[in-house]
Amino acid sequence: ARARNGDHCPLGPGRCCRLHTVRASLEDLGWADWVLSPREVQVTMCIGACPSQFRAANRHAQIKTSLHRLKPDTVPAPCCVPASYNPMVLIQKTDTGVSLQTYDDLLAKDCHCI
């Protein structure tokens, strides 16, 4: 079971691990040579700090938090990463024309600390 402790950010609003959206063009993403559409993507990603027990993904993340407090030089704090993803379909260039391809790990759906 996921021990998703604490959705209250002690660092202040918007400072802790959360979903963030950035509008990006195919050129920004480096996809222009193989993707035709969409020409712009609302990229959802996970950003922010992971203070003690905030959105801990599992017990390992809780242990990591505790050890980071004791040994910050050797144990890093948990990282804010996607907990799940939204699928996305792209129209791609192929040798013979164009095709559809679906990707299940491009866009973050929600975030946690691990």
């Epitope: 035709l36 559409s37 609302q42 939204n86 699928p87 379909v89 129209i91 679906t102 866009l107």
Partner: antibody, heavy 119, light 110 residues
Framework: EVQLVQSGAEVKKPGESLKISCKGS????????IGWVRQMPGKGLEWMGV????????IYSPSFQGQVTISADKSISTAYLQWSSLKASDTAMYYC????????????WGQGTLVTVSS | QSVLTQPPSVSGAPGQRVTISCSGS????????VNWYQQLPGTAPKLLIY???NRPSGVPDRFSGSKSGTSASLAITGLQAEDEADYYC??????????FGGGTKLTVLG
């Protein structure tokens, strides 16, 4: 309010040509793909193909490749589905539908255009 | 023959809970998402659930979706007369792109 308004019902003879339309409003027409879906009488939904109205890229279901042509005119926010030679088996309700942001589902649908092909 | 398999019909009395199944394979539901559409008699389909378990705004929380392995389910609780409709699941298949189930006719008894 997002709306997709399709052209009216058509009655045609086998061998005739036809072009039906789907006009989008209430959103940026070039920012969302448009798909076409067939529903034969008393049957289920079948995906026919998709167009990106911004770049006019089209991709067809293998079942409909070469049978129909999908196009769009972004200047009037309209997508089209056309046949060069209709068959009786083309008799069906045809729906246009807008794709959601990630291209994985259809979030808005037109009211449908009934095409009847009979001699 | 649809790539996704649904029961042709299900029924339930008002207030009851009913589920509609959608069975696929490792090339569609098994690795990707499922969406559900409701088609009321004589009308166009309407998006009911997307990406397995998300409801668009305006869809009552009586409707919920889930996915496990190569199958998905649509659950309707507190069944109402106006829920009588055809329900379609839809996913992605590596060979034929967007695929629909054959549809399930929901009858509200009484």
């Amino acid at each position: 309010e997002v709306q997709l308004v399709q052209s009216g019902a058509e009655v045609k003879k086998p061998g005739e040509s036809l072009k039906i339309s789907c006009k989008g409003s209430g959103y940026s027409f070039t920012s969302y793909w448009i798909g076409w879906v067939r529903q034969m009488p008393g049957k289920g939904l079948e995906w026919m193909g998709v167009i990106d109205p911004g770049g006019s890229y089209t991709i067809y279901s293998p079942s409909f490749q070469g049978q129909v042509t999908i196009s769009a005119d972004k200047s009037i926010s309209t997508a089209y589905l056309q046949w060069s030679s209709l068959k009786a088996s083309d008799t069906a309700m045809y729906y246009c539908a807008r794709y959601g942001r990630y291209g994985t589902y259809f979030d808005y649908w037109g009211q449908g255009t009934l095409v009847t092909v009979s001699s | 023959q649809s790539v996704l398999t649904q029961p042709p019909s299900v029924s339930g009395a008002p207030g009851q809970r009913v589920t509609i199944s959608c069975s696929g394979s490792s090339s569609n539901i098994g690795v990707l998402y499922v969406n559900w559409y409701q088609q009321l008699p004589g009308t166009a389909p309407k998006l009911l659930i997307y990406s397995n378990d998300n409801r668009p705004s305006g869809v009552p929380d009586r409707f919920s979706g889930s996915k496990s392995g190569t199958s998905a389910s649509l659950a309707i609780t507190g069944l109402q007369a106006e829920d009588e409709a055809d329900y379609y699941c839809q996913s992605w298949d590596s060979s034929s792109n967007y695929v629909f189930g054959g549809g399930t006719k929901l009858t509200v008894l009484g």
